[in-house]
Structures are given as structure tokens and as C-alpha cells.
């Protein structure tokens, strides 16, 4: 058993049929010695009396908020949560495996630049009785500070018969140098509680590996005289790290016909313009990627050919 | 060796071309190592990230773009002992900080070159003959060093009398390649920045 927050305790249980469970001793936080009674979850049933209460925790029915009273007055509370271990593996029932980029990916994180700011998100099919807290640091043995905000519900989607809820959190490394070469990874730890079930999830990464620039901005077409060719031009996204001559991007320009089956013409360039042939009803799209470190491509920025 | 300032891109800054080749070569070598040593801990998640140049050079600090010198977090240690002049830039453009920066890059390359050559000598003794260093990568390191044209003492190649542990050597190779790739990215950024200055 360990303390998660003030008056909130996590009982770690090996979860299998007829498991013996864990013996827990609760102590009432009071100088009083006599006339103390214990109840669970606002029930009127008295579970025991005295300054301490010993319980055998085996299942969720044994977890909950234990309260000690004296003469109708509440003295203190202790909330017991359960953390299940099945076949030596901690349960991951609360969050959905996103399976990207690999199996058992519960947390996904992205950064728009090298400023030390990043966003993580996760999915669940649970709509209520859910709470999260996020902590982060650079390295684990001698951790350096990363500050995370509160996790918020950022999207709701319908997937077949199920509703899926996306939560996200923004974090910022306290003292980040965009030019630094990372040798210690960022660690992100998410605590999740659903009803009386506790779970924790972790992710470890270098900012350089989770970079995904915003799409190029101000995408424009300039027709070239007496030609089917057009000059496409664009700019670096505002959110990208500066100076751009140091944090350079490379670009992919794509001409896509109306039908998905039509052949796509692609050009790669380090410049912020390119000359392409504009077909009728086609669209021109441009995306960006760090020029020197191949992390993710940005989403496409698009304009119609006409 | 100094080129006239008016020379159009890419001649203005010959090191840019070499640094791009370097990044390409080290990335290819790392990819080859990860494929060949698939049953060794050779991915970014599996290895310990060590920097053999730590406390010996200060490339990131010495080569910091002017725009980032206002960032407190970037200014941990801006002192370094290299104050020689390099030949990548036209002399009129070579400032003290640039010289410091280019000389730090040169020292990095020299250190990695020694490590890689020592390691290759060990790998050549491996009866499995599983992996060797790409000669192209070693050549590209040499070309960039020549383009930087710094005079510095030759570091003797490390020789070891004991029987090499090939498993450890291959893991060390992965660690070295990962670190060198990160440094090659920094070098490429620096060259691109100096080329635009």
C-alpha cells in the first residue's frame, strides 16, 4: 500500500481467483482514543470501532472511502484504490491501446518545434468517474523539471457502437534550449483513476523524435505565362523554431487529381517554392519535415489548381 | 583555400556540402547497423546515450545561432579552448565565434574518427564478420576535416592488447553511431546557418 495523495491510498493486488488479497490497517487521524466507529462510503453500517481498523482487501467491494467518526462527527477519511496485477502485468483497462507506432502505445506525444513544449494525448471509452494527473521530467535518476497543465477532454468521437474520448495535456520543459542535443529522454507519467481502479501509464521520448511541424502557411499559386506550369510558394509555419536557417525544413509538394486513384506527382525541395504542372480539377498540397532529422511530416496544406 | 565572397551557392560555403554528405553517410551507417544487429540493443530506446566529446568540446554552445544567445538555457558554458582559424568561410566573414565553432566541429570529427578507426580494427577481427564501418563514412569525415583545414595534433589510434569483446564492441558501435548522428545533425544545422549568414 502506498499514498497517492493526502488520504488517498493505492492497494496493489495480485488479481486471480481466490487470491488472498492484502491486509490493510487504517488509522484514524485524531488525538481521540475512545468512541471511534468506522463506515465505508457513507453507509450507515458500522464496520468496526477503535482508533485502527484492519481489513482484508481482496476486491473492489473492499475499496472505497473509509471514514472514522465520533458522536456523529467525521474525524478523517481514507480512500482506498486498487491497482490490479494480472500474471505479473499491471492492468491497462482504462486507456485504449492506440497501436501506433507500436502495440501497447497508450500515450502519444508530439511537439511542433524544439522549444521544449509538447502535447500528449490518450483515448478511453469511459465517459464518467474518471480523473487523470500528469507528471513529467527530463531523465529519471536526477530529474530536471517539466511542467504539465491539467488533462482536459479534447475530443469525442463515435467509433461504431462506441464513443471514444480523447484527453490531452500540454507540458513545457522548464529550461529548454532549442539547439541542445538531448541525451536524457523526457519521461511522462499519467495516473488514471476510474471509480476505485488505479492505473498508471508512462512514455519516454526525445523531443527530436516527436517533432511534427505545423503545415506550411500562405500557400499560393502563380501561373506562369504561356504554360500549364504554376509557381507554388509557401512560408515556414509560425510555430516552427527560429532561426530558420538553423532549424531548416524540407518540403514535399504533391499534385493530386480529384480521384484518389489518379497518379500523384511529387517533388521534394528545400526551398519555399516549386514549379509544377497544374492539372484541371487537381489540387496542390505541401507538407514539411525537419530537414536534418527525419521525424514526422506535417499535415498537408492544400490549394485547388483552378 | 579561401573562396571569394561573390561565389554563388553552394560554393560560398564548401563545408555545407560536406556536412550534408556526412549526415547522409552516418544515417545510412546507423540504419545498416540497426538492421544487421537486430538482436542487439541498437535502437534509440535501448541504448545509453553517451557523448564522447562531453567536456572535451562544446560545439552546441560555440556554434549557437546569434538569435539563441539571448536564451538563458542555451548559455550553460560558452567558454572553450579553440581559437584557431578555419578555411570554410571567406576570411572577411570569419569571426572569432565562428572560428571557435568550426574548430570545435573539427575536434569532434577527429575524436569520432579515432574511435571509429579503433572500433573497425576490432570488428575486422570478429570471426563472425558481422559488421564493419562503411568506408564511405570514414572518407566523408576525412573530407569535412580537410575542408575545415585546422591544424591540430594527430591523435594516435587507440590500440588494446586484450582480446576484444565483440558483443560489447557492437553495442559501443551503436552508441557511437547514435551520438555521431545527433552531432552530425547539429553540424549540418550550423553549416546551413553559417551559409545563410
Amino acid at each position: 500500500i502506498w499514498e497517492l495523495k493526502k488520504d488517498v491510498y493505492v492497494v496493489e493486488l495480485d488479481w486471480y481467483p481466490d487470491a488472498p488479497g492484502e491486509m490493510v490497517v487504517l488509522t484514524c487521524d485524531t488525538p481521540e482514543e475512545d468512541g471511534i466507529t468506522w463506515t465505508l462510503d457513507q453507509s450507515s453500517e458500522v464496520l468496526g470501532s477503535g482508533k485502527t481498523l484492519t481489513i482484508q482487501v481482496k476486491e473492489f467491494g473492499d475499496a472505497g472511502q473509509y471514514t472514522c467518526h465520533k458522536g456523529g462527527e467525521v474525524l478523517s477519511h481514507s480512500l482506498l484504490l486498487l491497482h490490479k496485477k494480472e500474471d505479473g502485468i499491471w492492468s491497462t483497462d482504462i486507456l485504449k491501446d492506440q497501436k501506433e507506432p507500436k502495440n501497447k502505445t497508450f500515450l502519444r506525444c508530439e511537439a511542433k518545434n524544439y522549444s521544449g513544449r509538447f502535447t500528449c494525448w490518450w483515448l478511453t471509452t469511459i465517459s464518467t468517474d474518471l480523473t487523470f494527473s500528469v507528471k513529467s521530467s527530463r531523465g529519471s535518476s536526477d530529474p530536471q523539471g517539466v511542467t504539465c497543465g491539467a488533462a482536459t477532454l479534447s475530443a469525442e468521437r463515435v467509433r461504431g457502437d462506441n464513443k471514444e474520448y480523447e484527453y490531452s495535456v500540454e507540458c513545457q520543459e522548464d529550461s529548454a534550449c532549442p539547439a541542445a542535443e538531448e541525451s536524457l529522454p523526457i519521461e511522462v507519467m499519467v495516473d488514471a483513476v476510474h471509480k476505485l481502479k488505479y492505473e498508471n501509464y508512462t512514455s519516454s521520448f526525445f523531443i527530436r523524435d516527436i517533432i511534427k511541424p505545423d503545415p506550411p502557411k500562405n500557400l499560393q499559386l502563380k501561373p506562369l505565362k504561356n504554360s500549364r506550369q504554376v509557381e507554388v510558394s509557401w512560408e515556414y509555419p509560425d510555430t516552427w523554431s527560429t532561426p530558420h536557417s538553423y532549424f531548416s525544413l524540407t518540403f514535399c509538394v504533391q499534385v493530386q487529381g480529384k480521384s484518389k486513384r489518379e497518379k500523384k506527382d511529387r517533388v521534394f525541395t528545400d526551398k519555399t517554392s516549386a514549379t509544377v504542372i497544374c492539372r484541371k480539377n487537381a489540387s496542390i498540397s505541401v507538407r514539411a519535415q525537419d530537414r536534418y532529422y527525419s521525424s514526422s511530416w506535417s499535415e498537408w496544406a492544400s490549394v485547388p489548381c483552378s | 583555400r579561401n573562396l571569394p565572397v561573390a561565389t554563388p551557392d553552394p560554393g560560398m560555403f564548401p563545408c555545407l556540402h560536406h556536412s550534408q554528405n556526412l549526415l547522409r553517410a552516418v544515417s545510412n551507417m546507423l540504419q545498416k547497423a540497426r538492421q544487421t544487429l537486430e538482436f542487439y540493443p541498437c535502437t534509440s530506446e535501448e541504448i545509453d546515450h553517451e557523448d564522447i566529446t562531453k567536456d572535451k568540446t562544446s560545439t552546441v554552445e560555440a556554434c549557437l545561432p546569434l538569435e539563441l544567445t539571448k536564451n538563458e538555457s542555451c548559455l550553460n558554458s560558452r567558454e572553450t579552448s579553440f581559437i584557431t582559424n578555419g578555411s570554410c568561410l571567406a576570411s572577411r566573414k570569419t569571426s572569432f565565434m565562428m572560428a571557435l565553432c568550426l574548430s570545435s566541429i573539427y575536434e569532434d570529427l577527429k575524436m569520432y574518427q579515432v574511435e571509429f578507426k579503433t572500433m573497425n580494427a576490432k570488428l575486422l577481427m570478429d570471426p563472425k564478420r558481422q559488421i564493419f564501418l562503411d568506408q564511405n563514412m570514414l572518407a566523408v569525415i576525412d573530407e569535412l576535416m580537410q575542408a575545415l583545414n585546422f591544424n591540430s595534433e594527430t591523435v594516435p589510434q587507440k590500440s588494446s592488447l586484450e582480446e576484444p569483446d565483440f558483443y560489447k564492441t557492437k553495442i559501443k558501435l551503436c552508441i557511437l553511431l547514435h551520438a555521431f548522428r545527433i552531432r552530425a545533425v547539429t553540424i549540418d544545422r550550423v553549416m546551413s546557418y553559417l551559409n545563410a549568414s
Epitope: K5, L40, D41, Q42, G64, T131 | -
Partner: nanobody
Framework: EVQLVESGGGLVQPGGSLRLSCVAS????????TGWYRQAPGKQRDLVAS???????NYQDSVKGRFTISRDSAKNTVYLQMNSLKPEDTAVYYC??????????????WGQGTQVTVSS
Amino acid sequence: EVQLVESGGGLVQPGGSLRLSCVASGDIGSMTSTGWYRQAPGKQRDLVASINSGGRPNYQDSVKGRFTISRDSAKNTVYLQMNSLKPEDTAVYYCNLRGLVLSTGLYESWGQGTQVTVSS
């Protein structure tokens, strides 16, 4: 901050029925238990019925078989269905919610109360 709003109280004849509702809003987090309490004039506030996170109900002896507590998690609402009302059920009924928000900790929240009067 969690807000609770009760509704459904009123004047009813003995033997009649009322359904109280308690709607929770704000960052509720994970509810551990919800209870309905009542306070008659000059008396202390007493627990009438409660329901825990697993949906297990609990009732004060005097209301067993007459009152039913239920919870609709999707609507963040707890109900108290009161049948066979007696004059001694007259009181102000309060909703209580206990829960956990990991960023702040345990909390307890009370509604402002709704008056139930059983009289002919």
C-alpha cells in the same frame, strides 16, 4: 469546483410519492459515493440513503422498502424515489457527493437543499 443542484421537492399528501434529483456539474472526477441526507427543524442532519461507486445502495432503517436511490452516471445525476411518504419524512433534503480529482485530491460537496413537506 463541484456544484450540486437538488430539485423535485414539494408538498405531498401522506402516502404520496416524490422523486428528488441531484445534478452535479464541474470537475467531478471519480465519484466515490453519493448520499441523500435530511434535516428536520431543530434536529441534526441524518443520512437517508447512499450509493457507492459500484452502485451498491444503503438505506436508513426508517426508509427501507419505501425509498430507492439510483444514479445515472451519464447525466451526473443521483435520484431519490420516495414512496409511501409519512409526515415524519418532512425535512430539507440535501444531496452530498464525495469524490476524487487527482490534481486536487479528495473533495466533498453539498447541495443547497430542497424542501419536502408531507401533510394532509
